[in-house]
Interface confidence: medium
């Protein structure tokens, strides 16, 4: 039945999320005649591209085509052939490419150029590859989860579609954690958004939303770890770094050149009298937490209140969906349950980090050691970021919902991105007749698409 036109009148869209650590391809599907309704688009496939993020191909751009092949071929199989030509394909690159662009605009452009040439070889309607801003990443994540939760629908339902759904029209805040950046996005309660850079105005389905968003570049879990290592190696007594964020007995040699490769460690860079150092885990949650807190500068705030590094953050309001690495890490640690208090999470993290590395390897034999070794750091980082960075408390912790999927669709920025670029979120409540393009929401950034 593959590649045969389906009797129903459906449409498809493809979005590639080119993240810092990997690329994922998402295929979305919706009934053609209902495309202006809220909650009708759903994800039918996720294909994780084998290999690192696209920014790592800077010295081997000729390999990008092969890298994308498997998942693009998968899309060819899933989407009926008759619809290939009208299926839009978008690629959005996030913080990994933002960092590469900071290092060299020319190198970032070269990577995107090869990506575009590779994707335009497929029979789909390729709409361009671009580096999305941190603000867009936050906004589209917020749109995605609220779209999937039915928050934009004017019809109040008597049932919940997800266990943590509050049956009202209050939107959820969005907490997104990637490898290189993290985003916080929510509607503050009657609070002026004191810094214009963090303010978004939307009109969706006839309702106005004043949304706060910020993307912290270099504060994704992978870059935060690089930052922490660069900070701590400055004061190590030799080329041995006794690190509380890794399990006791864990050892790993790190190249100083790798440590200083990322712009995120520039502020800690110094000439070290060695080219490599060895991490030796000592597995102490409290010390790890303390070390992480040193990455957050809370001494400077030019606003009524800040998150860290002088960035405005209004008082937290309502429920939050925490997704991407917030979810993956907490899911691995078995801490996503609504019933787990913040105190309990901290307790569990203390025990987990203190477990010897040999024991951990045995308990999780199927997990790649590189990932396995970093869960102590990542879990501690998530707690530090949410509690000290964003000022959640033991009480407001109850309002954080660790979400992987909603109604079968991954929580993340890709769905919101596609909904916006395909004009599927109307500014006004849909009438029985289709609306003209002029009434659709336009995010206040201009989108430059390369049509091939």
């Amino acid at each position: 039945t593959q590649n045969k036109a389906l009797p129903e009148n459906v449409k498809y869209g493809i979005v590639l999320d080119a993240g810092s650590s990997h690329t994922s391809l998402y295929i979305y599907k919706w009934p053609a005649e209902k495309e202006n309704d809220t909650g009708v688009v759903h994800q039918v496939e996720e294909c994780r591209v084998k290999g690192p993020g696209i920014s790592k191909f800077v010295q081997k751009v000729n390999e990008i085509g092969i890298y994308l092949t498997d998942c693009m071929e998968r899309a060819r199989e899933v989407i009926p052939r008759s619809q290939h030509q009208e299926t839009p394909v978008y690629l959005g690159a996030t913080a990994g490419m933002r960092l590469l662009r900071m290092e060299s605009e020319e190198l970032a452009d070269r990577v995107l150029d090869v990506v575009e040439r590779s994707l335009s070889n497929y029979p789909f309607d390729f709409q361009g590859a671009r580096i999305i801003t941190g603000q867009e990443e936050g906004a589209y994540g917020w749109i995605t989860i609220n779209y999937l939760l039915g928050k934009f629908s004017q019809k109040t339902r008597w049932f919940s579609i997800v266990p943590y759904e509050t049956n009202n029209q209050e939107t959820f805040g969005a907490l997104d954690l990637g490898g290189a950046s993290t985003q916080v996005t929510f509607v503050p309660q009657n609070q002026t958004i004191e810094s214009p850079d963090n303010a978004l105005q939307f009109r969706l389905y006839g309702k106005d939303y004043n949304v706060y968003t910020h993307s912290f570049l270099c504060y994704g879990k992978d870059q935060a770890l690089w930052q922490k290592l660069a900070k701590d190696i400055q004061v190590a007594s030799n080329e041995i770094l006794r690190d509380p964020c890794f399990h006791p007995g864990y050892k790993k040699v790190v190249n100083v050149s790798d440590l200083y490769k990322t712009p995120c460690t520039k502020r800690f860079e110094m000439t070290l009298p060695f080219q490599q150092f060895e991490i030796q885990g000592i597995g102490n949650y409290q010390q790890c937490h303390q070390s992480i807190l040193e990455l957050f500068n809370t001494s400077y705030c030019p606003y009524s209140q800040c998150a860290f590094n002088g960035i405005f953050l209004p008082p937290l309001q309502g429920d939050f969906g925490a997704f991407s690495a917030f979810y993956f890490v907490m899911k691995f640690l078995n801490l996503t349950s609504e019933k787990v208090s913040q105190e309990k999470v901290t307790e569990m993290m203390k025990k987990f980090c203190a477990q010897p590395w040999e024991e951990i390897k045995t308990s999780y034999a199927g997990v790649k050691e590189k990932y396995l070794s970093e869960y102590c750091f990542s879990g501690t980082y998530i707690l530090s970021l949410l509690l000290q960075g964003y000022h959640f408390t033991a009480d407001s912790w109850e309002h954080i919902h660790f979400i992987g999927k909603i109604q079968g669709s991954d929580a993340g920025w890709t769905l919101g991105y596609m909904l916006n670029l395909t004009n599927m979120i109307p500014a006004e409540q849909p009438l029985s007749t289709p609306l003209s393009h002029s009434t659709y929401v336009a995010h206040h950034h201009h989108h430059h698409h390369h049509h091939h």
Epitope: S237, E239, T271, P273, F274, F277, E278
Partner: antibody
């Protein structure tokens, strides 16, 4: 007090092997990285090799890479230099020295042991 | 590799003289530099570390300074026991490299 005593030097034919030892005392050997440095007759000092405190990191001078191997036994407080495929130009006094940055980089040296490579 | 160019290669001086020895680094060494003293039949002795910090127990007539990529060892008033060979050593990167040495002889 800190003491480093090298041994194992001698006369050896080109192409043959020799193992030098450096016995450490007066400090916590397992905390320190260790170096071998040599000095050819009438010449200056030349760095040879380094090993970190836990043996995880090793560096070699290009002139000895692939022929010399640095190792240590922390339980015996001893540093070693295994020298294979010896050449005439390896003739030198070999010194060991300890290393712990910032304050203790090559701060204590042994008296040296003489290696002569000659047919 | 970082080249350490030491000058002069030898000098003759009298007791009480002020003596200056210079090392120039071919690349940035960020102050990661030792000054060593070698006397025949004795273990090599470190005098100065981190470019200007005096090793404990070393007489205060020895001092180290830095000006850009030039590093200087100064002996303010030469004593009889100071006649020896002096080396600079950079430890900013591997391979560690030494200056060629300066032999200080009695005039």
């Amino acid at each position: 007090q800190v003491q480093l005593v090298e041994s194992g030097g001698g006369v050896v034919q080109p192409g043959r092997s020799l193992r030098l030892s450096c016995a450490a005392s007066g400090f916590t050997f397992s905390d320190y990285g260790m170096h071998w440095v040599r000095q050819a007759p009438g010449k200056g000092l030349e760095w040879v090799a380094y090993i970190s405190s836990g043996s995880s990191i090793m560096y070699y001078a290009d002139t000895v890479k692939g022929r010399f191997t640095i190792s240590r036994d922390n339980s015996k407080n001893t540093l070693y230099l295994q020298m294979n495929s010896l050449r005439a130009e390896d003739t030198a006094v070999y010194y060991c020295a300890r290393d712990l940055y910032y304050d203790h980089v090559l701060d204590y040296w042994g008296q040296g042991t003489t290696v002569t490579v000659s047919s | 590799d970082i080249q350490m160019t030491q000058s002069p290669s030898s000098l003759s001086a009298s007791v009480g003289d002020r003596v200056t020895i210079t090392c120039r680094a071919s690349q940035e060494v960020s102050g990661y530099l030792n000054w060593l003293q070698q006397k025949p039949g004795k273990a090599i002795k470190r005098l100065i570390y981190a470019a200007s910090t005096l090793e404990s127990g070393v007489p205060s007539r020895f001092s180290g300074s830095r000006s850009g990529s030039d590093y200087t060892l100064t002996i303010s008033s030469l004593q009889p026991e100071d006649f020896a060979t002096y080396y600079c050593l950079q430890y900013a990167s591997y391979p560690r490299t030494f200056g060629q040495g300066t032999k200080v002889e009695i005039k």
